[in-house]
Interface confidence: low
């Protein structure tokens, strides 16, 4: 549902988007993800901040926690214990890195309507969670793990060696958080809460990145983070499991690492509980083309965990790295030994496979020249997954159900025809046993969230349809969007083009390329967005294009792994190729073409500007990587190998932005970076600037003091205002 366009006389009453609209978030949308607590019940925070329990089958709802109670401790989040006796309330949120934060936690007793007094939790806590059954608590404080059998009980300390920036228990260090686990936690309860598994990360030997945080004091603070850059010493990881019923009996037991993994540097990549006494661990060699999935069983007699070689499953890539961005995780079936997993099929497309005994004997469940993206849920009779199969648009996501409990095991697209024009990009959230599920549609029309019956797929109700947004957009001249493809030298380049509202093919328009282009990313997606580039098209009359070139995801391994060991080559080439094709279309002003990107996109935009093609008049790089030697080991080595002479040092050196400093002479370049960027360090832009100065090349720059990789808050407004001025000047558009 894109608001319908009004023509002729009514068009006068419509207005273009303004930069202020974007910066104020005037046209932001809402989604509704139920917080499922059973097969037919979910919690949701109402508009007035009450925590409400909804029962789908009875249609009843009641407040389990009032906004008054939430406000009494300034709570910004909550968590109900599975036995429904207690709620934790989270306040004093303090962000650390992408996922991690610390907070203060209060436990509220629902049975007597009071906060639990005595044996209160320490503060600030790094991570806290309920057991999956009952109301045991596990939490991490000062890098150590603690256990409470009941909220009011004294804690049992599980680990003692935790030390800031040295030993992390139950939480990841920087690189595992950002590049491997993508979570703030590294502990996992077994399904019935009998065991607690956790990771210990030893960062003692990791080199430290240090940068100044200026703050308001007379002297800046120095932030120190153990951060392994490419080729540096990595964290040492160990996995332990403790019996939470008798935690002091034998204490934490270490889970053995598969021999073929332990023989050289390795990573732990994920842990999946199968039953209370069976656990599945995934490991990865430092050279990330071999992954091992190891299924381990509890040995009652020895109180240890046994991981037989017969339960080791190897996944190896001969054409690139293992997996997509991450190695996929298994979804176990009810027999507690076989599982479903997404990996490349013989044709080089990521598909769902069913593994019963060995990976070699895996049964391929989905197939075709498209990709399965995510397995949401496996029940006794159905498997729900998402893919981009429908109508052959890689940038769409639909939800499918395959019946696995009976024959024929038919496949049904649950979402393909629901709201076909409005909704082409879905995710889903399932209740226990998939009795019900919520569909969240992200576009291309205005997002909508709906509730469905898990057996019939029937829509039960609309959870959020963004009516206010729809009304607000009625008098806005939104740009037109097209998603199409270019066929170039046996490569398909999908692109999204954002066109001014009164676009006329016979006229010439300035072109802005927005690029990300990182391995296993996707920019051309059928999603709704009213953002900065929408404004540039709507108000400033620019054409904006996003292109998914080689290295991008969900179109098969040939495209994905094309960039393996040679980052910074094909991604740039494909952006340039696309620009040439856009010029051929006849409506682009060849003298007014720009490119911009953030992070990996800043790297690609910098290299494109320095390509010497003469195509680009100007460009912007926000927080770019400038040399792969400066970036994190886990990410960089996955795609580039090691920066050693006998591996890939030569391409590490050849692919820097600094090596092309001379080529910036004939373009207008704006370089932007936050000084407190923990992810892509300010070092990257400092080195670009140094190289440009040494080459006596003029450029523009902006730094954001004490800002990280996201450039948030007031910096965001300043950033987009500044970039707008730069582009308008470049394109000779009046302010």
């Amino acid at each position: 549902l894109r608001p319908s366009r009004v023509h002729n006389s009514e068009e006068n009453t419509m207005r273009a988007l303004t930069l202020k609209d974007i910066l104020n978030g005037t046209f932001s949308y809402k989604t509704f993800f139920p917080n499922w607590i059973s097969g037919q019940e979910y919690l949701h925070q109402s508009a007035d901040n009450n925590i409400v329990l909804y029962n789908i089958e009875t249609g009843q709802s009641y407040t389990i926690l009032s906004n008054r109670t939430m406000k009494s401790v300034n709570a910004s989040n909550y968590g109900l214990s599975p036995d429904r006796q207690f709620v934790y309330l989270e306040s004093d949120y303090s962000k650390l890195w992408r996922y991690s934060y610390t907070a203060t936690y209060y436990i509220y007793d629902l049975s007597n309507g009071e906060f639990v007094r005595g044996n209160e939790l320490p503060r600030p806590i790094q991570y806290l969670c309920w057991s999956p059954v009952g109301s045991k608590l596990a939490y991490v404080y000062q890098n150590n793990i603690y256990l409470k059998q009941r909220p009011g009980d004294p804690p049992f300390q599980i680990t003692f060696n935790g030390r800031e920036n040295k030993i992390f228990n139950g939480i990841p260090d920087w690189v595992y958080e950002e590049e491997m686990l993508a979570t703030k936690y590294a502990l996992w309860w077994s399904p019935n809460g009998k065991f607690l598994a956790y990771a210990e990360f030893n960062d003692t030997d990791i080199p430290v990145i240090a940068y100044s945080y200026y703050g308001d004091e007379q002297y800046p603070r120095t932030i120190n983070i153990p951060y392994p850059k490419a080729g540096a010493k990595n964290p040492v990881v160990r996995i332990f499991i403790i019996d939470t019923t008798y935690p002091a009996y034998v204490g934490p037991q270490e889970v053995p690492v598969p021999a073929m993994i332990a023989s050289s540097d390795y990573y732990f990549s994920w842990l999946t509980w199968v039953t209370d006494e069976r656990v599945c661990l995934q490991w990865l060699k430092r050279v990330q083309n071999v992954s091992v999935l190891s299924i381990c069983d509890f040995r009652e007699d020895w109180q240890t965990w046994d991981c037989p070689k017969t339960q080791e499953h190897i996944e190896e890539s001969r054409t690139g790295w293992a997996g997509g961005f991450f190695v996929s995780t298994p979804v176990f079936s009810y027999d507690a030994i076989s599982y479903y997993k997404i990996f490349s099929d013989k044709d080089g497309y990521k598909h769902i496979h069913y593994i019963k005994d060995t990976v070699e004997n895996a049964i391929q469940i989905t197939s075709g020249k498209w990709e399965a993206i995510n397995i949401f849920r496996v029940t006794q009779d159905s498997l729900f997954y998402s893919s981009n199969e429908f109508e052959e648009y890689p940038g769409r996501r639909n939800i499918y159900r395959i019946s696995i409990g009976s024959y024929p095991p038919s496949k049904k697209c649950v979402t393909c025809h629901l709201r076909k024009e409005r909704c082409q990009y879905y995710t889903a959230s399932f209740s226990d046993y998939a009795k019900y599920y919520a569909l969240v549609c992200y576009g291309p029309g205005i997002p909508i969230s709906t509730l469905h019956d898990g057996r019939t797929d029937q829509e039960i109700k609309i959870l959020e349809e963004n009516k206010e947004l729809e009304n607000a957009l009625k008098n806005i001249q939104l740009p037109k969007e097209e998603i199409k493809k270019l066929e170039v030298d046996e490569i398909t380049l999908w692109y999204k083009m954002i066109l001014p509202p009164q676009f006329d093919r016979s006229k010439k328009y300035p072109l802005l390329i927005q690029v990300y282009g990182g391995p296993c990313s996707q920019s051309v997606r059928s999603v709704f967005a009213v953002n900065w580039i929408s404004y540039l098209a709507s108000k400033e009359g620019m054409v904006i294009a996003l292109v998914d070139g080689r290295g991008t995801a969900f179109q098969g391994d040939k495209l994905l792994y094309a960039v393996y060991r040679k980052l910074g080559v094909y991604e740039v080439e494909d952006q340039i190729t696309a620009v040439r094709k856009f010029i051929e279309m006849g409506f682009i002003d060849e003298k007014r073409i720009a490119i911009w990107g953030w992070s990996y996109g800043g790297y690609v935009s910098s290299l494109a500007l320095a390509s010497g093609t003469g195509l680009f008049k100007c460009g912007i790089a926000v927080a770019p990587v400038s040399s792969w030697e400066y970036y994190a080991s886990v990410y960089t080595e996955r795609f580039m190998g090691l920066p050693t002479k006998d591996d890939n040092l030569e391409h590490y050196k050849n692919s820097t932005v600094m090596a092309r400093a001379e080529y910036f002479r004939n373009v207008d370049y704006l370089l932007i970076h936050g000084t407190a960027d923990d992810n892509v360090h300010f070092q990257n832009s400092a080195q670009i600037a140094k190289a440009l100065v040494n080459a006596q090349v003029d450029f523009q720059a902006m730094w954001y003091s004490d800002q990280n990789h996201g450039l948030s808050g007031l910096s965001t407004n300043h950033l987009y205002t500044h970039m707008t001025h730069f582009l308008k000047q470049c394109f000779s558009l009046s302010d």
């Epitope: 391929q364 020249k369 038919s410 049904k412």
Partner: antibody, heavy 118, light 107 residues
């Protein structure tokens, strides 16, 4: 009830062309991969070609590659096999089959006879 | 291509007999094997898929087993209506291939 009905068979000279059709009913055609399988007189079964549910992905046996084209029209619940440059060894009963995702062929049509002879 | 070698090519048995047909794949096909029954002048019918799973409505006297390269199809007690030609097929990868068939006759 699932039904697959082939048509379009007949006598054709070597080098000639023929277009087979398969009309289906009783299931959601657009959700299924479909195939053609043939059987020469008195011989065994030979897989010919497969097309994905959306119609974008096609697979062919080496013996027909470049000569046969499989296609489908989901709006019409129809599967097609365009056969060009026909040879005597293409003489067979051609069956249209419904495939499951990565599984066996669970429903077959009654077949249509193609005879290539001068 | 994967070859499916089926044996015997024909066999004669009496009503009530246990009948076994084997199929050998030239390379590992996991359990992606199906068995079909074809009566004279009729289209083939799916009996077994995933090497051992009976298709809907198929009598329990029909069974299949095996994985990797060696597969077996069994009729536990032959009935007169079972007179037909039986084919194995691998659907592990394209091109899909069939065995050459086993013609079953009543003694």
């Amino acid at each position: 009830d699932v039904q697959l009905v082939e048509s379009g068979g007949g006598l054709v000279k070597p080098g000639g062309s023929l277009r087979l059709s398969c009309t289906v009913s009783g299931f959601t055609f657009s959700s299924y991969t479909m195939s053609w399988v043939r059987q020469a007189p008195g011989k065994g079964l030979e897989w010919v070609s497969t097309i994905s549910s959306g119609g974008s992905y096609t697979y062919y046996a080496d013996s027909v590659k470049g000569r046969f084209t499989i296609s489908r029209d989901n709006a019409k619940n129809s599967l097609y096999l365009q056969m060009n440059s026909l040879r005597a060894e293409d003489t067979a009963v051609y069956y249209c089959t419904r495939d499951q995702v990565g599984y066996a062929m669970d429903y077959w049509g009654q077949g249509t006879l193609v005879t290539v002879s001068s | 291509d994967i070859q499916m070698t089926q044996s015997p090519s024909s066999l004669s048995a009496s009503v009530g007999d246990r009948v076994t047909i084997t199929c050998k794949a030239s390379q590992d096909v996991g359990i992606a094997v199906a068995w079909y029954q074809q009566k004279p002048g009729k289209a083939p019918k799916l009996l077994i898929y995933w090497a051992s799973t009976r298709h809907t409505g198929v009598p329990s006297r029909f069974s299949g087993s095996g994985s990797g390269t060696d597969f077996t199809f069994t009729i536990s007690s032959l009935q007169p209506e079972d007179i037909a030609t039986y084919y194995c097929q691998q659907y592990s990868r394209y091109p899909y291939t069939f065995g050459q068939g086993t013609k079953l006759e009543i003694k």
